[in-house]
């Protein structure tokens, strides 16, 4: 386990022509914050792919207001490091994305608006425990200067944070098969760290991060029992030399969670939710105090001064579980109302709202009927983030303020000519047709199809449509 640390030194216009405009103004003061996303390996992954090594969000920087006419200087930065804790081995090679975000502090509807100013990405090799590495990256006209390092959290040491060092139990030598920990010669190397979650009963490792199974067990974490009795499956006999794999007991059968932990099946194995005071894969680790650092992901440990009193982890936003070990997928709650798009920026949640909505969670329906009047006797109809006016006859437009052209829809059938009239429209029908919309043919014998023409009105006379 360890921490990747990022120190931003400056963010401002890069060298050369075309200096960017300041992102802040007297009318719209703003402040910056940064987000870092880490992924293992050197793969060119899409920016949207998960930050498998972790992500972090900085604090907000000081509020900045542009001096009119002045060029954009280096912008004021947030205090402190961005820290991304990692629980397993440091991969040695990693990809990073560093985003510079602007938070506008104007009085616009929906409170502070966020926008991405710049995004830089790169792929690097880095050994844990080494010195700070300095870097300069450019994104358009902006330049970002920063340093980074990876450091192991005691008792882990080494370039991958996979070796554990403990104080010597005897003054002269380390235990069988264990070497002194260079450069800490007064400490001894502890056993290897297997893959996280590797079964302590049924798995072992010879290399850091691996999980090899004892006979009779299988699965990536050696938690799935193998049945060795000969058997027939619905698909015929298994070709495995050790017999066959049967559905067998489920991973939670017999409840592998100790100390009152509750078991839930996962796609590959099981997961224990431990009561306070216990943790570990099977809730088997007890007598934990805050001094043992049981709270992961920056959780704050309270109580638990001695092994008999339970500790409580107060988890930071985005994490849950009795040890803050589980990342909350806050977007799965669909917090963005009215069709808004959810973005989980690490320690902050952002909603990108559909047109017609605003607010931190798109809860503000800008186009509802409240306070909106439809002119000329129109009535407001709202729904789904849009309001529309149902206009009285002779009016149209968004707010019924426009005089409608009653002839625009070509209401007169069979070639009849339309005339606008103060009370509606009038159709002058072509020979052989009659009716308010010239919809009825006139029979050759002079009798018309239903309905009959009103008395005194000959076919071909204008028909007023009221």
């Amino acid at each position: 386990a360890g921490v990747f640390e990022l120190q931003i030194h400056s963010f401002g216009p890069g060298p050369g022509p075309g200096a960017p405009r300041s992102p802040c103004s007297a009318r719209l003061p703003c402040r910056l914050f940064f987000r870092v996303c880490l992924k293992p390996g050197l793969s060119e992954e899409a920016a949207e792919s998960p930050c498998a090594l972790g992500a972090a969000l900085s604090a907000r920087g000081p509020v900045y207001t542009e001096q009119p006419g002045a060029p954009a200087p280096d912008l004021p930065l947030p205090d402190g490091l961005l820290q991304v804790p990692f629980r397993d081995a440091w991969p040695g090679t990693f990809s990073f994305i560093i985003e510079t975000w602007r938070e506008e502090l104007g009085d616009q509807i929906g409170g502070p608006a966020w926008s991405l100013l710049a995004r830089v990405a790169g792929r690097r090799r880095l050994a844990a425990g080494g010195p700070w590495a300095r870097d300069i990256q450019r994104a358009g006209a902006w330049e970002l200067r920063f340093s980074y390092r990876a450091r192991c959290e005691p008792p882990a040491v080494g370039t991958a944070c996979t070796r554990l060092c403990r104080p010597r139990s005897a003054p002269s030598r380390c235990g069988p098969g264990l070497r002194p920990c260079a450069p800490l010669e007064d400490e001894c190397e502890a056993p290897l760290v297997c893959r996280a979650g590797c079964s302590p009963e049924h798995g072992f490792c010879e290399q850091p991060g691996e999980c090899r199974c004892l006979e009779g067990w299988t699965g990536p974490l050696c938690t799935v029992p193998v049945s060795t009795s000969s058997c027939l499956s619905p698909r015929g006999p298994s070709s495995a030399t050790t017999g066959c794999l049967v559905p067998g007991p489920g991973p939670c059968d017999g409840n592998p969670c100790a100390n009152g932990g509750s078991c839930s099946e996962t796609p590959r194995s099981f997961e224990c939710t431990c009561p306070r005071g216990f943790y570990g894969l099977r809730c088997e680790v007890s007598g934990v105090t805050c001094a043992d650092g049981p709270c992961f992901n920056g959780g704050l440990c309270v109580g638990g001064a001695d092994p008999d009193s339970a500790y409580i982890c107060h988890c930071p936003p985005g994490f849950q579980g009795s040890n803050c070990e589980k990342r909350v997928d806050r977007c799965s709650l669909q917090p963005c109302r009215n069709g808004g798009l959810c973005l989980d920026l690490g320690h902050a949640l952002r909603c990108r709202c559909r047109a017609g909505f605003a607010g931190p969670r798109c809860e503000h329906d800008l186009d509802d009927c409240a306070g909106r009047a439809c002119a000329n006797g129109g009535t407001c109809v709202e729904g789904g983030g849009a309001h529309r006016c149902s206009c009285a006859l002779g009016f149209g437009g968004r707010d019924c303020r426009e005089r409608a052209d009653p002839c625009a829809a070509r209401p007169c059938a069979h070639g009849g000519r339309c005339y606008a009239h103060f009370s509606g429209l009038v159709c002058a029908c072509a020979p052989g047709y009659m009716g308010a919309r010239c919809e009825f043919p006139v029979h050759p014998d002079g009798a018309s199809a239903l309905p009959a023409a009103p008395p005194g009105l000959r076919p071909g006379d204008p028909q007023r449509y009221l």
Epitope: G110, P317, L333, R337, N338, P360, R361
Partner: antibody
């Protein structure tokens, strides 16, 4: 323990003004949005106003828009409701209530005991 | 505005009874529905948020369900301390609106 304590209620004449306060303790005040909700005598609950954790966003019910102003002082863990141009129909018990963290659900998870505002000549 | 219609407006029940209160929204509120309890003294407590999630410290006899426009609060076995008025509230679209309330009285 989360605690919200309202104060500032009283008797006021129509057209008058009143400023309600809400003192918060037992949680990180600056992390939470806060609501004002009122209840007229013998009636149900009516949402009045909301202010976001940083104070940048505020919302009002149409019935009080333009007359009431919600504000907060995070340094003092205090919330305020300035009520101007008061009407008889503003007579109610006024509660302050804490919003949920990050306003994912727009709940009001902890409430004060309320302060009574009476508008009468 | 989204109108919230609660029913019944009052009901009489005995200790141990199963009680169901319904709340109907005038349009889809996508599960952003919260339930509150108000005791005669005036104190208001959040019971359930996001349709079915129990607020911390709320007994498991309270449960919620629903989607779209129709939502339900159920008390599986009414206890003496449950006699109170219950309100639903939508948290989907401004302005936040409450139902008219349901008073649960002793039979």
């Amino acid at each position: 323990e989360v605690q919200l304590v309202e104060s500032g209620g009283g008797l006021v004449q129509p057209g008058g003004s009143l400023r309600l306060s809400c003192a918060a303790s037992g949680f990180t005040f600056s992390d939470y949005g806060i609501h004002w909700v009122r209840q007229a005598p013998g009636k149900g609950l009516e949402w009045v106003a909301y202010i976001s954790s940083g104070g940048y966003t505020s919302y009002y019910a149409d019935t009080v828009k333009g007359r009431f102003t919600i504000s907060r002082d995070n340094a003092k863990n205090s919330l305020y409701l300035q009520m101007n141009s008061l009407r008889a129909e503003d007579t109610a018990v006024y509660y302050c209530a804490r919003g949920d963290y990050e306003d994912i659900f727009y709940t009001m998870d902890y409430w004060g005991q309320g302060t009574t505002v009476t508008v009468s000549s | 505005d989204i109108q919230m219609t609660q029913s019944p407006s009052s009901l009489s029940a005995s200790v141990g009874d199963r009680v169901t209160i319904t709340c109907r929204a005038s349009r889809d509120i996508t599960k952003f529905l919260n339930w509150y309890q108000q005791k005669p003294g005036g104190a208001v407590k959040l019971l359930i948020y996001y349709t079915s999630r129990l607020h911390s410290g709320v007994p498991s006899r309270f449960s919620g369900s629903g989607s779209g426009t129709d939502y339900t609060l159920t008390i599986s076995s009414l206890q003496p301390e449950d006699f109170a008025t219950y309100y639903c509230q939508q948290g989907n679209t401004l302005p936040w609106t409450f139902g008219g309330g349901t008073k649960v009285e002793i039979k």
